[in-house]
Structure formats: structure tokens, C-alpha cells
Interface confidence: medium
Amino acid sequence: LEVQVPEDPVVALVGTDATLRCSFSPEPGFSLAQLNLIWQLTDTKQLVHSFTEGRDQGSAYANRTALFLDLLAQGNASLRLQRVRVADEGSFTCFVSIRDFGSAAVSLQVAAPYSKPSMTLEPNKDLRPGDTVTITCSSYRGYPEAEVFWQDGQGAPLTGNVTTSQMANEQGLFDVHSVLRVVLGANGTYSCLVRNPVLQQDAHGSITITPQRSPTGAVEVQVPEDPVVALVGTDATLRCSFSPEPGFSLAQLNLIWQLTDTKQLVHSFTEGRDQGSAYANRTALFLDLLAQGNASLRLQRVRVADEGSFTCFVSIRDFGSAAVSLQVAAPYSKPSMTLEPNKDLRPGDTVTITCSSYRGYPEAEVFWQDGQGAPLTGNVTTSQMANEQGLFDVHSVLRVVLGANGTYSCLVRNPVLQQDAHGSVTITGQPMTFPPEA
């Protein structure tokens, strides 16, 4: 007996009714008295519903099943499952026996749409560009588990710091919570798309965050866009300015300089007076220029550890702030060149040429060239070690086979200062000693 069921799973929404289709072809003269119809769970063989001895034996499955009794004689053995639950998902087998018997299994795929995501922001007050925030996207009571995607306002995927958790409730429906940790730009839209993979249904929420620059009519604080480059040991000026209104007096001014990342206080001017340096006594304000709106900070005897971002907060009635970057640099010394071995050299010998340059910052770029200016990229090993002040000593080693004669030069570049320091060694074809003897 041929029993027919749909090949594809039957998709049913939680709470709705589903029809598990099953049919057979009755022969002429067929009567329901001949029919044995059994629906059971394919895996556990649990009885779901049966029709035997000419009558409906009823539901054995939580009283939520029914047959289409008026269509049974035409060969329609379909089962109606009411108020579908997540737990109903799975395979149901339809057994039909008249004289012969046949069976086939139909899959029930349960689904529930996810709610429109709600978006929450933490922290949600006094946000400024550069702050790290946590955006949570929550969508509820869906099934099966969702796929979650994050995007920025340009449509680019945000795959970075995302944690997604999905928890099933007692009905088996999932609540999805996806958390994005992000550093705020000047402003930005962050959107979360929750997809039900069975229904191909997308629910999306988005949040646009405009960090407070300052309230309308607030103080506009101006700092240089480019980093301030300062040499180690010299003094640096971190420029910051505001436009004082007519009648402005220093008694109204609150000026705070702090490290942008750690919020450590660097220097302040409040209650009409200079509160002094909170940063190793190496900072000063231009007090005679403050009334004209010059809030710049002088940082003395710059160290490598000073590198980073400093924020200038100006508050009069309203407030404003801006961050300025300090880029520390130190020039590299003229390289010293050493040769090993350095006696009785002949063409064809392999030598090791070491180029050493000291006390630079940041890390150097090292290039080797031959006497024609062609790069020597072959057997080069470069190491850079920071001393206790954070300054780097660079040692670059070139292994080379000597030609008839040749010049080998080493160029040590400071990428911030765009300063090049170079040394070279010339090795002639005659047997020689390095350095040449007097």
C-alpha cells in the first residue's frame, strides 16, 4: 500500500494548528470498516491518534489531535495538530493498513517569530567620543535559535566584541541577548538584526548615539587635529583654546586637563586660581594668557611614558572638551658599524656586518643598501630593545658574501621624525683589516 506524505518538513508557528498531510489510494469498494490508521511518533513509537474497527479511537496525544473523518474514505489520512508547541517538533509516522499496509514519516518543524529587538545602552549618560559602551540587543520568544548580525551605520559588519546568549524558557522558546562592546565615534548608528533561520524572518533594531560634544551655545574648545610631536627631554605645549564671551572673568572658569584614557588628573584651574600640577610637577598653564582663552598646557622634560591623549575640559557656564594627542620621539644616534671577522678578508668570504644605533623612539625602521643604492633585503636580522626610559637601542645584522669590493650602508629611520641616521662600511678587494689600520 502506497502512503504519501510531503517531502519537506511542515513548518508550524507555535500556538497555531498544523496539518500533517498523509494520503493513500483506496481501492473500489473500500469501506472504513477495513481501515486501520495509526499515527505515532517516529522515534519513540508513542501513539498519537488512531482509527480502527471502523471508528475514531481519538487522540492519545494531549487531546490536541484530530483526523479529517469526512475525508478518510477518499484516502485522506491527514492529522490535525492543534495549538502547536515547541515540544511537538519532530517526525510523525502515518501507518495505513487495509489488507496490505504502508507507512511514511512526515517532519514537523516548529517556529516562532522573534520580537522586534529592544536596544539598551550602558552607560547611557554623558557619553563622549572615545567612551566604551555596551549595546544590548534583546529579542524574545522565538524558535529555533536565532542568527544575530551587527552592523554600523555604513552597513559594515561589526564582528568585533560581540557576545550572544540564547536561553530557552519553559515553553522552549528562546530569548536572545546580544551584547556589543564598542568605542564611540563622533556619532554612530549600531544596528542588530535577529534572524529566524526557519521562517527567514528578520527583526531589527538600531540605536543612534550622538555623544555629547556640548549643549547648544556651549563652549567650543579647539585643539590641534594632528598629534603634537615632542622630543624626549624637551618641553611640549599641548594647545587648547576657547572663545571667552564679553565680561568673562577667570573666577567663572573651571579648566581641567586629564589623561583621556585613565581620566587621571594632570592639571587644573578652578575657583579663580591655579590648582597646580597633579602630574609629577612637570605641567604648567599660561596663566597670563588664560583670560584671552588660551588654556594650553606646558609639559616639561617630556618622557616616553607621557605619550598618549590628553583631554582639555573647559567649563564656564556651559562646558566643552577636546582631546589632543602627544607623540613622543627621540632621534636615533649615528649608527656604529662592526664587522666580523674583521681581518684578512677576501672576496667570497661570508661576513657579518652589525649596525647599532641608540636611544631612539619610537621603534626604528632599518634599511640596508649596497653602494649603488640597491636594497639588501637578504640575510638581515634586526632587534630592538627598550631601556628603562623606554628608548630603543637597535641592532641590525647583515650576513653577506663579499664581492671584489663593496660598500654596505645601513639606514636607521625614525618614522615619526622622518629622521634618517646612516652608517656605512666599505670593503675593498685586497686582503684587509677592519677598521683600516693607521
Partner: antibody, heavy 121, light 106 residues
Amino acid sequence: EVQLVQSGAEVKKPGSSVKVSCKASGYSFTSYTIHWVRQAPGQGLEWIGYINPNSRNTDYNQKFKDRTTLTADRSTSTAYMELSSLRSEDTAVYYCARYSGSTPYWYFDVWGQGTTVTVSS
Amino acid sequence: EIVLTQSPDFQSVTPKEKVTITCRASSSVSYMNWYQQKPDQSPKPWIYATSNLASGVPSRFSVSVSGTDHTLTINSLEAEDAATYYCQQWSSNPLTFGQGTKLEIK
């Protein structure tokens, strides 16, 4: 009318660099990212990277990262793609395209006419 | 990276025939876009955000999704539909395109 107009065809030697321009008009240049896509003769489309003209942030396909520089000049609403260390397999049509839409759905809605770059010794 | 594999690479079809092109993603994508390209022309946006027709695209085009398979269907092919079609995703970096499916009219 929104359009992207690219610079003319280039013939280059292996090892050299090429800089292709893409001038935007008819919309606010800083509001959308400009992407670069190339198509070798008879081949499919390959993404090179993009630039956000507003922030000047860039992102590159790892395959092109070391040889490609994307820049944007806001004053002239022009995006540039520079490809260095050219080799014969870089022979292709290079397209700029605007990535547009609304959150969370985006697509390339406007394409430049393409710039043919031929690398040959 | 997410690899998009289109099938078939090439199809020769008679007008009025129904055509399907499948784009299979190596993992889930948040949305898929499709572009049409004719010889010596720039690509044109065709379908965006999985199933939305771009401006001017005839209603005989549609897209269905099953898992990671996105299927572009042309209900009744017309001569003007002869072109190469590309799918595209940007759910994760890098942005990728399918290798393209070329439709030819018999």
C-alpha cells in the same frame, strides 16, 4: 544626478604604481563609503577595500592590504586608489562604487564607469 | 572568509523559460545582494537586502532563501535578461562576490 566618474585607462610597467581617481557628484560625498572592486578580463568581481570619506577610515581585503592605498579628498569629492608593485595579473578593470542604503541593508547602488589598467612590459 | 559559490556558471536558455541561479554561502549571511552586468558595462544593482528589487528591475525576478542557499528566479526569461549575475555579501570581512552566472539566450 548621482554619479561616479573615473579617470582614464592606464598602461603600466610591472613593478610600477597606478593611481586611479573617482570623482563623486550629485550627493554628499562624506555620507557614504566608497569601495573599490576589480574585474580581470573574463573574470568575476573582486573587492579591494573601502574608504569612509568622512572619517578617512579604510579597510582592505587582506589580499591587497600591502599594496593598496585608498585616500579621499573631501574638498574635491574625489576618492583615489593607488596600487603599487604592479604585476601582469593586476591587469583588470577597476571600479569605484558607492555603498548605500539604510540600516541594516546596504548595497552598491552607483558604480563608476570603470578604469582599465593594463600591466605589460 | 565567507565564500559564495554560484551555480551554474553558465546557462543557455530559451525565452519564456523559468531560470534559477543559486548562490550558496559557506556560512550564514545577514543579507545578500545581486548585481547584473552586461558586456562592457559596469555592474548594476539588481536585488538588495536578500529579496528587494532595485529600481527598474522587472517583477519577474525574485529570490528565495533556504538555509545558506539564496536562489534567484526569473519567471519567464526575456531577451534583455541575458547578462552575468553576481551575488554579494558583507556579513563579515572581507566583502565577497560569487564567481558569477552567465545567462545566454538560445
